[in-house]
């Protein structure tokens, strides 16, 4: 842990500024609050400063969670983990952020989408997703259903489908009914991968029944 | 239902200044979102005029920044639209309109019937 | 800002017909551009967002799609009550601008 006790910083943005140029687990505060949360900053892709939401890369950590685990974060920061919808939605909601989608098939390919705006409702409104601006290489149409949908968990059913999704595919997420997306879905290894309905994926770069192996979702202010 | 309702004079002098009230039922407009006029002139020509978001931050076109000003009431579930110096040009059919996206420009669901604004002497 | 250079601008045709208008902006609008459809005396109606998403309620005759800086949007089989006046819109970057407009005429 790389945190200074005099310093505060929002995200990870804030920490490479102030001279951190090194990757690893930082403690960041609060939007307008001294409650604080550690997260993995990336400092070295693409320029840096790139606050870790979600990481994963080896089925290590249960992602069938409640929506409070969801909201508060588990894992570990320098592995599997999730930051937390609470901190995330403060934090979008405080200026522009981008979000950048890292993905990683079985068979040595990387793919990335990146949405130019990016927040999350509040939880009164179910940390709806908001996305806007979207480019890379992992399809040419959102994967996350587009206008976002509301978050929901194995305790918290908010999707659009008569099913329960969360329940069904695994894993909280912005469900549609049930859409094309889950990067929370069950972690199959490799050989094990594919005609997988509840796996981690990405429709619009492999399909609805492949697994993916490695996910990295991460934001970083716009304006950095 | 959401529901949005413009209201407002009909005429406007030169180089007045016009307001427009929006009435939102149906969505608290601090709940999300952003809060849009557009503007239709003679001809069918659509033109963004500016939003406030939920948060209360506003975001103007430029070819009107110097002449616009959007404000809301929170209390009365409103937002406002005020245009300074208005000329002959500033004659159209004037629409509040809510986005699907609370911090930046996007399409727009929900619109009001609109309201005719005419600038004359 | 974004040109959206959009076309025909008026179109003459027959129930049952399946008709195609093109929007091209003179940047990449990525996919963030919409079609909306207004009918005589009233206000413009959300169509297809997102380039291609149809929005709640809007008939499957209706589609949208394309990428970066060319858009379609079409009406498999058109219907007396499609007469409207349809325009794109991109929301890619601000300030967001409309295409000129199509005029659907029925024969």
């Known amino acids: 842990d790389y945190k200074d006790d005099d310093d505060k910083f929002r995200d990870c943005a804030e920490v490479f500024k102030s001279g951190h140029t090194t990757n690893g687990i930082y403690t960041l505060t609060f939007p307008n609050s001294t409650e604080e949360i550690k997260a993995y900053c990336d400092m070295e892709a693409g320029g840096g400063g790139w606050t870790i939401i979600q990481r994963r890369e080896d089925g290590s950590v249960d992602f069938q969670r409640t929506w409070k685990e969801y909201k508060v974060g588990f894992g570990n920061p320098s592995g599997e983990y999730w930051l937390g919808n609470e901190f995330v939605s403060q934090l979008t909601n405080q200026q522009r952020y981008v979000l950048k989608i890292h993905l990683k098939d079985w068979e040595g390919n990387e793919a990335y989408s990146l949405y130019e705006h990016f927040y999350l409702s509040s939880e009164e409104l179910n940390y709806r997703i908001h996305l806007k601006g979207l480019t890379g290489t992992a399809g040419k149409i959102s994967s996350i259903a587009q206008p976002g949908n509301d978050f929901s968990t194995k305790d918290g059913d908010n999707d659009k489908c008569i099913c329960k999704c969360s329940q069904m595919l695994t894993g909280g997420w912005w469900f549609d009914a049930c859409g094309p997306s889950n990067l929370n879905g069950m972690y199959y290894p490799q050989r094990q991968n594919t005609n997988k309905f509840n796996g981690i994926k990405w429709y619009y770069w492999k399909g609805s029944g492949y697994s993916l192996k490695a996910t990295t979702m991460m934001i970083r202010p716009a304006d950095f | 239902d959401v529901q949005l309702q413009e209201s407002g004079p009909g005429l406007v002098k030169p180089s007045q200044s016009l307001s427009l009230t929006c009435t939102v039922t149906?969505?608290?407009?601090?709940?999300?979102?952003?809060w849009n006029w557009i503007r239709q002139f003679p001809g069918n020509k659509l033109e963004w005029m500016g939003y406030?978001?939920?948060?209360?931050?506003?975001s103007y076109n430029p070819s009107l920044k110097s002449r616009i000003s959007i404000t809301r009431d929170t209390s009365k579930n409103q937002f406002f639209l005020q245009l300074n110096s208005v000329t002959p040009e500033d004659t159209a059919t004037y629409y509040c309109a809510r986005s699907t996206f609370g911090h930046y420009v996007s399409s727009m669901d929900y619109w009001g019937q609109g309201t005719s604004v005419t600038v004359s002497s | 800002s974004i040109v959206m250079t959009q076309t025909p601008k008026l179109l003459l045709v027959s129930a049952g017909d399946r008709v195609t208008i093109t929007c091209k902006a003179s940047q990449s609008a990525s996919n963030d551009v919409a079609w909306y459809q207004q009918k005589p005396g009233q206000s413009p109606k959300l169509l297809i967002y997102y380039a291609s998403n149809r929005y709640t309620g809007v008939p499957d005759r209706f589609t949208g799609s394309g990428y970066g800086t060319d858009f379609t949007f079409a009406i498999s089989t058109v219907q007396a009550e499609d007469l409207a006046i349809y325009f794109c819109q991109q929301d890619y970057s601000s300030p967001p601008t409309f295409g000129g407009g199509t005029k659907l005429e029925i024969k």
């Open positions: 149906g969505y608290s407009i601090t709940s999300d979102y952003a």
């Open positions: 406030i978001s939920y948060s209360g931050s506003t």
